[in-house]
């Protein structure tokens, strides 16, 4: 299957690579602008050159193109725990990234939010916090892993998921209960 | 086919508590991010709270902060919201949500289910 390819695409497919095709005259292909800048004016005729021209601060452009307008630069989610690594320059969007021992939850393909990485108190840790991954964490005996944390087996409740890692305790327990009664 | 239904809502006085719940069909819910998303009367959807799969990871708004808690049950395949201290700005249809698209920092959903009413009145 040939993917279907917009109208742009199809115009540019047209002219060389590093070309577009001039929007008032087909004949005519222009040069991409730089990185870092926009598309000021066409080209007035083949081998002349376009008026590009550098985006504003607050804007930039990450690749040749030809558009009319920089793209507005992204800000880091406060609110998301976010923290900037590098801000945005002509020809670079801001990079927003976490602190350190924390680690990214995607929430969509391009909203994340920053998490401080587990300790694993009462375990081990089994894998290391990631970038995009907390921490895998390993329960001691006595201990079950809830929400990633290591949660003593005397709060395993029959109904939950932890009776069949904490069972010898409940047993214990129970025995415990037992023979205090005899 | 995905299904999600919500319950729960009604009205309630100012300062007053409610927990809505969801319930989800066709779909492994227990590895699924899931959100709960309100729209007020003449107003825009606003993304209100989230939780990732095992519950570990949540987000709430900063309007409902503090006085929302939402929480899951992968063995019900059910979505609760907790919502105390409610106030008359907390009237909304309050929706359960899947799969969150985020276009140019506005979050829209793929599926969602028919909502509950909360009206917040004295």
């Known amino acids: 299957l040939v993917p279907h390819l917009g109208d742009r695409e199809k115009r540019d497919s047209v002219c060389p690579q590093g070309k577009y095709i001039h929007p008032q005259n087909n004949s005519i292909c222009c040069t991409k602008c730089h990185k870092g800048t926009y598309l000021y004016n066409d080209c007035p005729g083949p081998g002349q050159d376009t008026d590009c021209r550098e985006c504003e601060s607050g804007s930039f452009t990450a690749s040749e193109n030809h558009l009319r307008h920089c793209l507005s630069c992204s800000k880091c989610r406060k609110e998301m725990g976010q923290v900037e690594i590098s801000s945005c320059t002509v020809d670079r969007d801001t990079v927003c990234g976490c602190r350190k021992n924390q680690y990214r939850h995607y929430w969509s393909e391009n909203l994340f939010q920053c998490f401080n990485c587990s300790l694993c108190l009462n375990g081990t840790v089994h894998l290391s916090c990631q970038e995009k991954q907390n921490t895998v964490c390993t329960c001691h005996a006595g201990f079950f892993l809830r929400e990633n944390e290591c949660v003593s087996c005397s709060n395993c409740k029959k109904s939950l998921e932890c009776t069949k890692l904490c069972l010898p305790q409940i047993e214990n327990v129970k025995g415990t209960e037992d023979s205090g009664t005899t | 086919e995905v299904q999600l239904l919500e319950s729960g809502g009604g009205l309630v006085q100012p300062g007053g508590s409610l927990r809505l719940s969801c319930a989800a069909s066709g779909f492994t819910f227990e590895r699924y991010d899931m959100f709960w998303v309100r729209q007020a009367p003449g107003k825009g959807l606003e993304w209100v709270s989230g939780?990732?799969?095992?519950?570990?990871?949540?987000y709430y708004a900063d309007s409902v902060k503090g006085r929302f808690t939402i929480s899951r049950d992968n063995s019900k395949n059910t979505l609760y919201l907790q919502m105390n201290s409610l106030r008359a700005e907390d009237t909304a249809v309050y929706y359960c949500?899947?799969?969150?698209?985020?276009?140019?920092?506005?979050?829209?959903?793929?599926?969602w289910g028919q909502g509950t009413l909360v009206t917040v009145s004295s």
């Open positions: 939780i990732s799969p095992r519950g570990r990871e949540t």
């Open positions: 949500a899947k799969d969150m698209i985020n276009y140019h920092g506005t979050p829209s959903f793929d599926y």
